[in-house]
Amino acid sequence: ECVTRLFKDIHFEGGDIATVFTPSAKHCQVVCTHHPRCLLFTFTGESASEDPTQWFTCVLKDSVTETLPRVNRTGAISGYSFKQCSHQISACNKDIYVDLDMKGINYNSSLAKSAQECQERCTDDIHCHFFTYATRQFPSLEHRNICLLKHTQTGTPTGIMKLDKVVTGFSLKSCALSNLACIRDVFPNTVFADSNIDSVMAPDAFVCRRICTHHPGCLFFTFFSQEWPKESQRNLCLLKTSESGLPSTRIKKSKALSGFSLQSCRHSIPVFCHSSFYHDTDFLGEELDIVAVKGHEACQKLCTNAVRCQFFTYAPAQASCNEGKGKCYLKLSSNGSPTKILRGTGGISGYTLRLCKMDNECTTKIKPRIVGGTASVRGEWPWQVTLHTTSPTQRHLCGGSIIGNQWILTAAHCFYGVESPKILRVYIGILNQSEIKEDTSFFGVQEIIIHDQYKMAESGYDIALLKLETTVNYTDSQRPICLPSKGDRNVIYTDCWVTGWGYRKLRDKIQNTLQKAKIPLVTNDECQKRYRGHKITHKMICAGYREGGKDACKGDSGGPLSCKHNEVWHLVGITSWGEGCAQRERPGVYTNVLEYVDWILEKTQAA
């Protein structure tokens, strides 16, 4: 059962598994949610104790019954992990805490104009977990405006003290706001020789990378595969760090793989969700339960629904035994990873999908695309929306993309002459315009946010956000697309598609079925040559065939230029402008979404 409320002046008795320091009960709940075993917690505020060393303690708790006795204690705040909830969970914490100093290893000190600048510095520093900033009112003159960057082994403070005239807060790496480069490559036959901060068992290098990504101290990893010569090290995932943030030595060794944490490209890649099945593999760990079920998918579902289950092994039934039901072993461990991995056992193993909700919904795999043809099929582009105007009569106005459960990203030029959001309707999960009838449900628009530097499509800043009146429930046919990660600045996208209900040629009409076209990106230099009368800025991105023939056209405006990279779709561009449609040597010009990620996050998180 999902319990989101906090219980004031209540202490949960017993079940302690760890104690950390957090600046608030809300943050304690997030830490509990991300801890592999924590189901409940008790946070001690300032008023709960005479002893300042006990302030801000967050005691993480576990219980076989998923509950603990409640004891009245002034100043204590208790609650439950969000593991039991189905809603989206984020480790992102943008709060700034006044007159608190979160303790850690202070490794960098520099002047900053503001707490925000200090937080940005922390976010863009590979080692930084949190910071403390001394304001200009700080008593010690030499420390005024000093920004202290801090880290700890666990990523949480080693203590929290009251300190006047300072503010403290966390790195925003987990909010996908880091400008650090994001290295997605996994290097085969490579060992990184640097200090190990931890080691866990993993079935493959990709699970190892995910574990590294959400381990606060891990910057890169080495994984020894099943074929590694030393038996005791097989399936071992070594979590590593270095002072520079990069491996100091790379050793060529076959059957080992190495790679980097994806901490700076969060939100556009699954980090918590290990959805694969591992055949002929047993995961060892503490047994929680053994249940007879039909098939490994059912076993995974059972594990996902059991809040304490972290991973499972399914032993298929022997032919014609037990109505085809095999044994499903639900398991857990102290760190969420198997204590040992055995191969050649005939079992099928995997992980709970409970943690998938900690990843951005946009990273969820969608059904495979139908190759060939220009008409889309249902669920192929679940982020695509059709924006209608009801004035003077109802018609399709523009495309748009779902980027959050209350947010549509589209083009600013769509709203020329639109006086009020009241005349707009957003239809989601639509394939054919003919599906839209009088009684078809739609989302009203609460607010239109147009970039304040927008003048006309050709001069850039052709971007707008629509805040919906109600929130979207995600399904297979309606879900968000990932924004490009700022760490992905150097990614070359090769699988890009433009979609919309727009004209198929210059003088045409709106199409009934959502159309799709695969279009290659064009460099800005090349694009500039094709549009000598315009300035193609870095805030624009171009796509099209030299010979023409495939392009976005009237009615596609505001819709997505979607590019698939590492199995995840990214909203790379917003259909903006072009000379004619699909003309030879006239690529389509799109708003370069990467350049507006900060603007999007600022607007969507402030509203």
């Epitope: 202070n106 960098n108 000190s109 520099s110 002047l111 403390t132 010690s140 003159l141 030499e142 420390h143």
Partner: antibody, heavy 124, light 107 residues
């Protein structure tokens, strides 16, 4: 042992520039600020400015603004103070002095370690 | 800028006697005040910081008091090595400023 060792005495002509160095040892150079203080013959102490060796940020006394430049070289744990457009009244002993520990936000402990001083004589 | 005024300019004291030095700030500097001792041909040496805290290795005969605008350095029993010039310095606001100094000489 914590030490600040300054460069030797200098004799300069009016209008010239002088660059005094101060090499730190025995502690983590980038963790403490560094001040420059001067003392004219028979006079009191006069604060000139401060540098944060970690980021290189500086703050100068209004009197020296535009004439003084403080820099640092983290590879050699050395700070430098350059004073330009020298005049006779710049004749003084120039001291570097270690300031606050910048990796902890507790209060200032004063200038606890001083260099031996560098005599700069400005004379035509 | 904050002006620091020390008095007296010269203090004549016999060894073993008590010496009291004053320092006044033109505006409040809270407790952000330090005292230094300087002997001829030597660099200054930190005695007191935070108005009343003795620096490492400073004998107990040196004590500081005061806050706001009025501060005192007391040497309870003068030793021969204590005859020197003493400076107060505020570190409450930029620019840092020193007093003109008090010379403690043998009576």
């Amino acid at each position: 042992e914590v030490q600040l060792v300054q460069s030797g005495a200098e004799v300069k002509k009016p209008g010239a520039s002088v660059k005094v160095s101060c090499k730190a040892s025995g502690y983590t150079f980038t963790s403490y600020s560094m001040h420059w203080v001067r003392q004219a013959p028979g006079q009191g102490l006069e604060w000139m400015g401060i540098i944060n060796p970690s980021g290189g940020s500086t703050s100068y006394a209004q009197k020296f603004q535009g004439r003084v430049t403080m820099t640092r070289d983290t590879s050699t744990s050395t700070v430098y103070m350059e004073l330009s457009s020298l005049r006779s009244e710049d004749t003084a002993v120039y001291y570097c002095a270690r300031g606050a520990y910048l990796l902890e936000l507790y209060y200032y402990y004063g200038m606890d370690v001083w260099g031996q001083g560098t005599t700069v004589t400005v004379s035509s | 800028e904050i002006v620091m005024t020390q008095s007296p300019a010269t203090l004549s004291v016999s060894p073993g006697e008590r010496a009291t030095l004053s320092c006044r700030a033109s505006q409040s500097v809270s407790s952000n005040l330090a005292w230094y001792q300087q002997k001829p041909g030597q660099a200054p040496r930190l005695l007191i910081y935070g108005a009343s805290t003795r620096a490492t290795g400073i004998p107990a005969r040196f004590s500081g008091s005061g806050s706001g605008t009025e501060f005192t350095l007391t040497i309870s029993s003068l030793q021969s090595e204590d005859f020197a010039v003493y400076y107060c310095q505020q570190f409450n606001d930029w620019p840092l400023t020193f007093g003109g100094g008090t010379k403690v000489e043998i009576k």
